[in-house]
Interface confidence: low
């Protein structure tokens, strides 16, 4: 039987290489059973994670999984850094692994690092 605890599926050490000026969506995959938890995004600043309260977010629902999305419209150079999503569930705070955005300024686009979204084998969710 599957656990009914809320789970946040951000992979450890995940990272995205993105270009300043582009739109981007940062996904926090959330698994829950009955009631959708309250989820927030924060940006790491040293040892603290600063809550992103004034940013555009949305939910995308799929079967068996939902996504809490942080929108970058567009990506700015100072969006570079590490982010974490957290869920409040039955008075418990569940935190995801951090995910890092590497933002390359348009002016130096030719030097943009070519990082694949995932270097290791794919993790098959249902297969």
């Amino acid at each position: 039987k599957e656990s009914c605890d809320v789970q946040l599926y951000i992979k450890r050490q995940s990272e995205h290489s993105i270009l300043a000026g582009d739109p981007f969506e940062l996904e926090c995959p959330v698994k829950y059973c009955a009631n959708r938890p309250h989820v927030t995004w924060c940006k790491l600043n040293g040892t603290t994670c600063v809550k992103l309260e004034d940013r555009q977010t949305s939910w995308k629902e799929e079967k068996n999984i939902s996504f809490f999305i942080l929108h970058f419209e567009p990506v700015l150079p100072n969006d570079n850094g590490s982010y974490r999503c957290s869920a409040n569930f039955q008075s418990n705070l569940i935190e995801s692994h951090s995910t890092t955005l590497y933002v390359t300024d348009v002016k130096s686009a030719s030097e943009r690092p070519s990082k694949d979204e995932m270097a290791s084998r794919p993790w098959l969710l249902y297969r």
């Epitope: 992979k11 582009d22 079967k63 694949d116 979204e117 249902y126």
Partner: antibody, heavy 124, light 107 residues
Framework: QIQLQQSGPELVKPGASVKISCKAS????????MNWVKKRPGKGLEWIGR????????NYNGKFKGKATLTADKSSSTAYMQLSSLTSEDSAVYFC?????????????????WGTGTTVTVSS | DIQMTQSPASLSVSVGETVTITCRAS??????LAWYQQKQGKSPQLLVY???NLADGVPSRFSGSGSGTQYSLKINSLQSEDFGSYYC?????????FGSGTKLEIK
């Protein structure tokens, strides 16, 4: 081993209906979307729609609304597509295809397992 | 609905050559793109998923690239078994439309 076995060829008259099947094995049928795709001779692939067998929820390409009806039977791990009011334009090979997911630094989708294809010929 | 514009429609090439097929989405699809190969009378086969990841068993001469609205499939050193039709497909919200296809023929 994941497999999708489709029903045999159909020869049907214009105006009639046909129901083709796709039997899945080797994976959790009820918790994975099943897609249907049309291929006409000399034409490209067209996405018809998909069904989630767990609860019967379906999404359709607007072009096929009213033409195709998707259903699924969890007990037999079989997906069905009924095509109605058939015309020569519906003569094609129809494929079912299982939708997979992977997780990198985001979720992504793809059709990784395909059925053998069912040929439907509409002729008087 | 998102439209996928695939080019070229056909290519006539020799074994050993390199080819690139492109797909343009009508809006940002955030790498939610797959590439398939289909041979005459056969079922399509997944080649690349999430724009850049090779499916199991696909030779390394195939590679996918792109982001945003522009994506491409590159085949290095074409082999005789690579001839057939190629399609892109987006997964950025239903309907999951395909590109119009590229037919790869032997010169």
């Amino acid at each position: 081993q994941i497999q999708l076995q489709q029903s045999g060829p159909e020869l049907v008259k214009p105006g009639a209906s046909v129901k083709i099947s796709c039997k899945a094995s080797g994976y959790a049928f009820s918790s994975s979307w099943m897609n249907w795709v049309k291929k006409r001779p000399g034409k490209g692939l067209e996405w018809i729609g998909r069904i989630y067998p767990g609860d019967g929820d379906a999404n359709y390409n607007g072009k096929f609304k009213g033409k195709a009806t998707l259903t699924a039977d969890k007990s037999s791990s079989t997906a069905y597509m009924q095509l109605s009011s058939l015309t020569s334009e519906d003569s094609a090979v129809y494929f079912c295809a299982g939708e997979g997911h992977y997780y990198g630094s985001g979720y992504r989708w793809y059709l990784d397992v395909w059925g053998t294809g069912t040929t439907v010929t509409v002729s008087s | 609905d998102i439209q996928m514009t695939q080019s070229p429609a056909s290519l006539s090439v020799s074994v050993g050559e390199t080819v690139t097929i492109t797909c343009r989405a009508s809006e940002n699809i955030y790498s939610n793109l797959a590439w398939y190969q289909q041979k005459q009378g056969k079922s399509p086969q997944l080649l690349v998923y999430a724009a850049t990841n090779l499916a199991d068993g696909v030779p390394s001469r195939f590679s996918g690239s792109g982001s945003g609205t522009q994506y491409s499939l590159k085949i290095n050193s074409l082999q005789s078994e690579d001839f057939g039709s190629y399609y892109c497909q987006h997964f950025r919200g239903a309907p999951f439309t395909f590109g119009s296809g590229t037919k790869l023929e032997i010169k």
